[in-house]
Interface confidence: low
Amino acid sequence: ECVTTLFQDACFKGGDITVAFAPNAKHCQIICTHHPRCLLFTFMTESSSEDPTKWYTCILKDSVTETLPMVNMTGAISGYSSKQCLHHISACSKDMYVDLNMKGMNYNSSLAQSARECQQRCTDDTHCHFFTFATRHFPSIKDRNTCLLKNTQTGTPTSITKLHEVVSGFSLKSCGLSNLACIRDIFPRTAFVDITIDTVMAPDPFVCRSICTHHPSCLFFTFLSEEWPTASERNLCLLKTSSSGLPSARFRKNRAFSGFSLQHCQHSVPVFCHSSFYRNTDFLGEELDIVDADSHEACQKTCTNSIRCQFFTYSPSQESCNGGKGKCYLKLSANGSPTKILHGTGSISGYTLRLCKMDNVCTTKIKTRIVGGTQSVHGEWPWQITLHVTSPTQRHLCGGAIIGNQWILTAAHCFNEVKSPNVLRVYSGILNQSEIKEDTSFFGVQEIIIHDQYEKAESGYDIALLKLETAMNYTDSQWPICLPSKGDRNVMYTECWVTGWGYRKLRDKIQNTLQKAKVPLMTNEECQAGYREHRITSKMVCAGYREGGKDACKGDSGGPLSCKHNEVWHLVGITSWGEGCGQRERPGVYSNVVEYVDWILEKTQGP
């Protein structure tokens, strides 16, 4: 239950986890919300005690029952974490605190004209967590107009005291207001040296990056994958820092991934939401509860609805007598991450979705599908693009999918005859081809990147990336689709749609309105039975009906096979090839995007 009220002159009894310092109760609530285990807090104002060392203490609390007895206490303010609330959670704190000295390590001192200038300096300094500015009326003349940049291991002050003529505040990095370079790349086969400030367990480099982003002192990270040679170090996420703020060196290391904290990225709020399932994987941690569940999805839902659950492991039933229900182990730990990750266990693990309140663009829910019919409506498939070739005359060439603000994923065979990017135009937000006029805005293509193992569509590797000349701004009608996670390799998607302007039968023409068809995925074995003359590899995924009918066709190539999973749309396939269109036992064959995630990341984010 979400409780937003702050209780004045009240203190929660017991349940203490740790003590932090905060300038006010609102900020104490932010600290509690971002702490992996805090559910309740009590904040001590100046009137709470005659002992100044007790002032501004923010006591973080946890409780098995999710509440604690409340007792009267003058000057105390108590409340609940916002974890329980549905609204967007932000760590952004723009307030200035007059006559408060927030203490930490004073690692930089300089002159500033104002507290705002000092705050911006803190925001633009890699290491700064908070600052204290001495005004021009500060008693000590030599310290007037001094801007002290400070940090601590926890990101919060080590203490807060009253001090006249100073102003304190926090870095605005979490508000997206930093001018520091934002490097979103994850570098494969790379290990950063430098100081490791903390190690946690993570199932993949993306989770590791999120953990780094939310760790106050982590500036970059190295993740050792499950194939890392030293068994005891597998799945280790090494959180790192350096005095310069950037890695001092990097080494080529197979099975290691490295990247940067996203804490100071402009215009994006870091995501603390991991929706993937990790198959054949056990997350170890403190057990909160064991319940029956029909599936790993149901287990994740149970974990999400249980406020204290941070991650889970679902053990499918080996027997049929209990109705096929499996065991759902709800777990937690001190830092929100598994204490150990085991592989080859037959279990499926994952994280709570409770923290999915931090916008990750592609995971944002979009307009509800229109059920029935074959024609799409505006904004229904905002990642779908139409790729036009302008030479010798302009025409629709292929479909494609927006996967980043400068990246389109499509099929390699679209470029069998087209080699030059300057004859290509990407139109997004289009429903009808007739909307495209001479003055319709488009994105030019800077580079065509074709998979280097591509020979022909039927042999696989039918995948290509288009790098746009300019980055697109996301709108309701142009929006990226999420790539599937490698952890979702074995997910059986139940709601998949193929979209495109392609032919509706073998001898036809390009359609004016974007068409859609719901198609079920089928196993590669089932698909292979219909294509004896070709080899259906793991790099391909098939979709369609045994009896034929709904299918992709000429002109749909390169377009998306979009599947909904956990309320998020994933790009599961890229329309590649098939025998005829909608023929019986001849399903559509798509490039299996999950098999190319490393390649996509290497090309879009690598050096």
Epitope: N179, A181, I183, S242, S243, S244, G245, L246, P247, S248, A249, Q266, G444, E469, T470, A471, N473, P607
Partner: antibody, heavy 116, light 107 residues
Framework: QVQLEESGPGLVAPSQSLSITCTVS????????IYWVRQPPGKGLEWLGM???????DYNSALKSRLSISKDNSKSQVFLKMNSLQTDDTARYYC??????????WGQGTTLTVSS | DIVMTQSHKFMSTSVGDRVSITCKAS??????VAWYQQKPGQSPKLLIY???YRNTGVPDRFTGSGSGTDFTFTISSVQAEDLAVYYC?????????FGGGTKLERL
Amino acid sequence: QVQLEESGPGLVAPSQSLSITCTVSGFSLTGYGIYWVRQPPGKGLEWLGMIWGDGRTDYNSALKSRLSISKDNSKSQVFLKMNSLQTDDTARYYCARDYYGSKDYWGQGTTLTVSS
Amino acid sequence: DIVMTQSHKFMSTSVGDRVSITCKASQDVSTAVAWYQQKPGQSPKLLIYLTSYRNTGVPDRFTGSGSGTDFTFTISSVQAEDLAVYYCQQHYKTPYSFGGGTKLERL
């Protein structure tokens, strides 16, 4: 495609002010920072300042008091204004687009001569 | 402010040679250094950013290395079209700054 083009007065008298416009196409000024760099005849490159995507500015410390950078996103234009010009401000003035703090696309530059 | 120093104003080379240009920062700039090529009458062209990342379309004979205060730009096998002036630039902290430039000329 991405293009930047500078336009300036060419000749300015000493102690007068300078105004140069950088017109960009192929990308949005809300998403990219723009730098100004100059190069005196036969000499090296000097970083003058920049305007970030959201309008904030940074300047070369030595020139800060004489420089002003602004922009008009809707017209895709960035403006460099510099006052109290001296003969040693004679240079070719370039605008360039930000890329991780480096500059991936440059204009062709506009030549400024300060002379009476 | 950070000062970038390229100790050699000129370097002589022949086609096919391996050549290295050095650049020193007055303070630690980690790996935030870019290298540019400028030919007479042309605008500078970005070759390398973040010390070792080649810009799109830059041949792999151009490489960069270093960290902290000492940086090196290398052309593994000089081609005739590589004769130009090369500048380093720190993009660690504003105000950003360039080195004085090194002119690569025929021996």
